[in-house]
Amino acid sequence: KNLKSPQKVEVDIIDDNFILRWNRSDESVGNVTFSFDYQKTGMDNWIKLSGCQNITSTKCNFSSLKLNVYEEIKLRIRAEKENTSSWYEVDSFTPFRKAQIGPPEVHLEAEDKAIVIHISPGTKDSVMWALDGLSFTYSLVIWKNSSGVEERIENIYSRHKIYKLSPETTYCLKVKAALLTSWKIGVYSPVHCIKTTVENELPPPENIEVSVQNQNYVLKWDYTYANMTFQVQWLHAFLKRNPGNHLYKWKQIPDCENVKTTQCVFPQNVFQKGIYLLRVQASDGNNTSFWSEEIKFDTEIQAFLLPPVFNIRSLSDSFHIYIGAPKQSGNTPVIQDYPLIYEIIFWENTSNAERKIIEKKTDVTVPNLKPLTVYCVKARAHTMDEKLNKSSVFSDAVCEKTKPGNTSK
């Protein structure tokens, strides 16, 4: 009886794993084996596909074959018993185009209100993604084990920290990789769960802000308790992208080591141009807090995004605010040749209830004020460009009294 050639050959490539699957054409014929040949582009001869010769099942693995993943390849299969079937040719394909990104490896570390996620490519030193290692981004889905309500986080790198979690709570997450340059989305990792710890005695510092004063950077933060010492560390932001490397060499800022105030001042020349992460830790001598949230610090933007300077003209029921260019040392205005949005916060001096106005214009009216009442105003600038999504610190608050009720404009 003539053997029929196998049909429906599927090529599955996940990372560096090359798997072939096919259907038997004739289930009634026993003891049939299958063999593959391959042919590279521009070659006439067919070569035996190692790992896929005389296979008794309907699946084989040819991962050991060292292929150029960007080069087109053709496969053919036949059935063998005493005689052989005709060859069945599989549509040619380019491994890189066909490849899927496998599930990444995930390593979790827990704090009381945060989880650190370390992500590595599923295949170490992958040949398939050798040129794309630094281009991987990841996305994750996280949920409280008790509730199942999912939160998605997109565009993260090989180290990511999730904050504002609840202590003593189990969180579960799964991660997938993407190569946006090649329009490839990977498959999810298995689900990983971790329980946050009991609440730490000392909370981490909060609300870290960097501003520029003269030739110095001023780093400020808030802290709950007095009589503490603080230390500040920095890391090049690009190091979070480094696949497979999970040794992060955070560095001390010398002028911010064991400081006893909730701010520190250090020269601008501590940092070369670049994007950095900054974090702060508190200690009372016996106990240490976990590290604060890491803030992104871009020297280029920081250097030129200063808080706005403004004048207030007071009326009975409103303020007119005129925003000018910020002043550098020496009272020279800073020229800012990129569009800004201004955020103006105002409040009655005797109250904590703040109101906010967002304006593109440099002359702003603050309406609906009470006569003969002291209001305070502070402002900050935001870049409008999404790529330079940056905010200045707030200006110092300026307080003014509104005019009596009969003031006309």
């Epitope: 390593h107 009381d112 999970h246 830790q281 106990n287 976990f290």
Partner: antibody, heavy 118, light 107 residues
């Protein structure tokens, strides 16, 4: 194959100094931290400190601050610890260890025995 | 400094048994704990890192658990080659500190 090779045993006088070496094979010490750990006979492990060979930044346990000095020479892929003002309390085995991913001391040298005796 | 306390200096067990080695930190260290095994006359070797991750090549009879201040190393189906001293270490903040060690004796 990753390996840490430490210098040979030392017999030193009280009050003197000793400098121990640890050479890395199969990896570049610049990409890691290099730690030093002390272990006295039938005692636990004590962390002395570590260096980042890339920029020579060091951290020390308060107990060893001033007594131990950790250095590194990236050209020879070697880390060193110098311990000064030695006393009988410093008779111990000194280990170097590589600080790798997740800050784990993942590879250890074979240890150097230091005996302080007159 | 963070003090790591291993309350049991010695533990005696038999081949095939299950044994738990405990370690307590003087303050919350998250999951930043490593367990080492040191056999007589040898250097320490990593068993478990980040409280629960088994280091590559370590047999799966070694399991780590815990977070915050309380950590446990479990050796199930103890083998004669597990005769060693076991140390915990915190890597949460400098100075790194080790527990005093627990010696496992095989009956």
């Amino acid at each position: 194959e990753v390996r840490l090779q430490q210098s040979g045993a030392e017999l030193v006088q009280p009050g003197a100094s000793v400098k121990l070496s640890c050479t890395g094979f199969g990896f570049n010490i610049k990409d890691y931290y290099m730690h030093w750990v002390k272990q006295r006979t039938e005692q636990g492990l004590e962390w002395i400190g570590r260096i980042d060979p890339e920029d020579a930044e060091t951290k020390y346990a308060p107990k060893f601050q001033g007594q131990a000095t950790i250095t590194a020479d990236t050209s020879s892929n070697t880390a060193y610890v110098q311990v000064s003002s030695l006393s009988s309390e410093d008779t111990a085995v000194y280990y170097c260890a590589r600080g790798g991913n997740f800050y784990v001391m993942d590879y250890w040298g074979q240890g150097t025995s230091v005996t302080v005796s007159s | 400094d963070i003090v790591m306390t291993q309350s049991q200096k010695f533990m005696s067990t038999s081949v095939g048994d299950r044994v738990s080695v405990t370690c307590k930190a003087s303050q919350n260290v998250g999951t930043n704990v490593v367990w080492y095994q040191q056999k007589p006359g040898q250097s320490p070797k990593v068993l478990i890192y980040s409280a629960s991750y088994r280091y590559s090549g370590v047999p799966d009879r070694f399991t780590g658990s815990g977070s915050g201040t309380d950590f446990t190393l479990i050796i199930s189906n103890v083998q004669s080659e597990d005769l060693a001293e076991y140390f915990c270490q915190q890597k949460n903040s400098y100075p790194y500190t080790f527990g005093g060690g627990t010696k496992l004796e095989i009956k």
